[in-house]
Interface confidence: medium
Amino acid sequence: LRPSRVYKPEGNTKRALTLKDILNGTFSYKTYFPNWISEQEYLHQSEDDNIVFYNIETRESYIILSNSTMKSVNATDYGLSPDRQFVYLESDYSKLWRYSYTATYYIYDLQNGEFVRGYELPRPIQYLCWSPVGSKLAYVYQNNIYLKQRPGDPPFQITYTGRENRIFNGIPDWVYEEEMLATKYALWWSPDGKFLAYVEFNDSDIPIIAYSYYGDGQYPRTINIPYPKAGAKNPVVRVFIVDTTYPHHVGPMEVPVPEMIASSDYYFSWLTWVSSERVCLQWLKRVQNVSVLSICDFREDWHAWECPKNQEHVEESRTGWAGGFFVSTPAFSQDATSYYKIFSDKDGYKHIHYIKDTVENAIQITSGKWEAIYIFRVTQDSLFYSSNEFEGYPGRRNIYRISIGNSPPSKKCVTCHLRKERCQYYTASFSYKAKYYALVCYGPGLPISTLHDGRTDQEIQVLEENKELENSLRNIQLPKVEIKKLKDGGLTFWYKMILPPQFDRSKKYPLLIQVYGGPCSQSVKSVFAVNWITYLASKEGIVIALVDGRGTAFQGDKFLHAVYRKLGVYEVEDQLTAVRKFIEMGFIDEERIAIWGWSYGGYVSSLALASGTGLFKCGIAVAPVSSWEYYASIYSERFMGLPTKDDNLEHYKNSTVMARAEYFRNVDYLLIHGTADDNVHFQNSAQIAKALVNAQVDFQAMWYSDQNHGISSGRSQNHLYTHMTHFLKQCFSLSD
């Protein structure tokens, strides 16, 4: 028997992190995103739940809605009408899927200082929003869309087709919510509030995933979700636009689908209003390498939306799928015709292009062996975007301004030199025309949020600097974090290594690989975090490594598309390559190497453990995918094609975890899954377990009853991380 090892951080002044610290969220940080209501005004919910109004220019601030009003209806969120006469208050939040939830809504009249009575909103509501002008309300109730011209008016029913699990109006079904829109809504107001565009999803022919929810009753209930798995029938989508001024005169008008899209199965991918009578729709073929952006105009003469073919712009990938994780959306110029969009250049790097007439004639705005990530705002004279250009680190994000008014356009990095050590990963929040903006820095140091002048980029004030967190971390021994790259053959892999306090290169440490590795993901980011792996390094003396292998994002299409049609090959191979390189560094105990991952990471960790290399002693898979045939059509097919004989069925079969059951014989494997996982169904782990049992391979398993993909209920989460900690410490012979 190997003697148990106890890691004792040296020095007495500071203490190590405990698992309790992590589970209690003791060291969580705050960010500050202004809720912009004009060019220079915003709202923010204070610590004590007052809704406070701020004017940057007059320095005025006052409570617009008191915490007592919020508390009177147990409100947890709010929304101010654009005419500033009303506020909706949201309560009874009830989570559904990743983004969707239902809630009860109350309308508060700011003028009268009382709640609007009469024609009160039904409950629970699936989605509610104000028009961009005035105080019209659109809401979705029982899968149908309703309109109120004013909060106290009777509602007008726009759609009648809504039916639970069958037809969804104005809200996405499961697969569109998770894999395409990444929102809880599928309706969009025109800028002047005249038109309301919405999507109808028809799920009538989609197979149902059914699972038990045990609850407390004598009998479990069954959850049924229309969920298209790879190769199955997909939702049928239609886009409609209704004139909200006269909704009863002219019914919803259907927007045509581009011919080259409509000729076979297709998806709707996004809608962008360009002007009050111009809308831009994006469509995608089911084989997701062709995307079409279609600009449509309202024809007053025959009350319809026309989408001429010369206003169709095609984006096609010849090496993989179109776009990154999602197809990018356009940022239109003031002329309401030309737009800026991120897509791959001839070298396969995602960059900003300016499209005036055709995609073929697009003018490339940014270029280089790095990627533009997101366009925040286009104004008359400036374009603000984020990229990972600075100093060549793919895991950083800086905000840049291109002065498009100048000829040639000039580029300036707004954030690169602000707080260079503390801040290397930014996002931003802009007022309507970018007169002011907030910068939110996520690390690698303590997060900080600041307010800036949109013309000069001058910092106006610090909004949140996490002083309390800074103080509470003073007596904590935090691990050291390094972000570096390693080379293997012609490939470069970025990695993040979390080293125990008082790390000594001459000693040997156990190694835990944390992996996600999904297409277009990124794990090696310059962000601040105090989480489970921070604790493992701080208290248990474990070296943690995260590696971005092939298939991960923001390093060009050659690297990204390497995994196209062959998931489960290079992601695993690259983790193994990295482990071998880490062993060569000399401070890793080869006998004590583990790997763990969640979701896609559970898939990769399972395949890595079953690689037959003997590199890993043990590993954990939480809620793993085990076969791409079990996962959602939009996701699986984007990267794998169809599971048909004449397409890619062979690799669908070869890439399952079950196919490698025999190879788990020489590793300790902990398999964990929530039974109410709507996303990666429990079926995935059930099939792994069945294959391991059939192969007579011993393994450990834990299920979490009625828990979803996040296993996030307080008690389940505590149990999960405690259980995984015990498993790892046992594997690494660390005493409790």
Epitope: T161, R238, A304, P308, K309, N310
Partner: antibody, heavy 120, light 109 residues
């Protein structure tokens, strides 16, 4: 196999009414916009009316606007054309036509037509 | 509204000959949203060409379409006996406001 079968034509006096039907089969009816196209004896083709797949949007040629009403019953896979205040110039063979997609595109399938004669 | 003018009104040709039918639009047809149909006496029209140049399913390759903007052409490379019929062009660029040409009759010389 896609099939469109019109019915309801016949002889009617000026000012009278008729309701044409088109029974569709062989495709997912609700997923396609449909149209009525007519052809007066010895003349060319004239588009009359169109309706979206859901029935939410309807369109008419100026010559029939206010007199004709297009509708559909997706549960019965049937398209209709209600013709009121009929005139002599409405005399024609009326064809029901399926568009190629959900949207307003070319007609990939046509019915055989039904003859409407408006005469006193 | 877009007016389509077909020429000639009648085309008299022999089997084996090449037929060239013209369709001119009063204004530009959005991105080649133009279709050609064939109609034989007592029958419904049949789709031949869509998108100005794409052949519909089951249409022989002797039929071809070309053109863009305002000028479009339907060509039958070698007339077969069954090709003698009336041919209509149709624009669907401003659809659902469809318009048809007045037709070109191809008859046997």
């Amino acid at each position: 196999e896609v099939q469109l079968l019109e019915s309801g034509g016949g002889l009617v006096q000026p000012g009278g009414s008729l309701r044409l039907s088109c029974a569709a089969s062989g495709f997912t009816f609700s997923s396609y916009a449909m149209s009525w196209v007519r052809q007066a004896p010895g003349k060319g083709l004239e588009w009359v009316s169109a309706i979206s797949g859901s029935g939410g949007s309807t369109y008419y040629a100026d010559s029939v606007k206010g007199r004709f009403t297009i509708s559909r019953d997706n549960s019965k896979n049937t398209l209709y054309l209600q013709m009121n205040s009929l005139r002599a110039e409405d005399t024609a063979v009326y064809y029901c036509a399926k568009t190629h997609s959900t949207s307003w595109y070319y007609f990939d399938y046509w019915g055989r037509g039904t003859l409407v004669t408006v005469s006193s | 509204e877009i007016v389509l003018t077909q020429s000639p009104g009648t085309l008299s040709l022999s089997p084996g000959e090449r037929a060239t039918l013209s369709c001119r639009a009063s204004q530009s047809v959005s991105s080649s949203y133009l279709a050609w149909y064939q109609q034989k006496p007592g029958q419904a029209p049949r789709l031949l060409i869509y998108g100005a140049s794409s052949r519909a399913t089951g249409i022989p390759d002797r039929f071809s379409g070309s053109g863009s903007g305002t000028d479009f052409t339907l060509t039958i490379s070698r007339l077969e006996p069954e090709d003698f019929a009336v041919y209509y062009c149709q624009q669907y660029g401003s659809s659902p406001r469809y318009t048809f040409g007045q037709g070109t009759k191809v008859d046997i010389k």
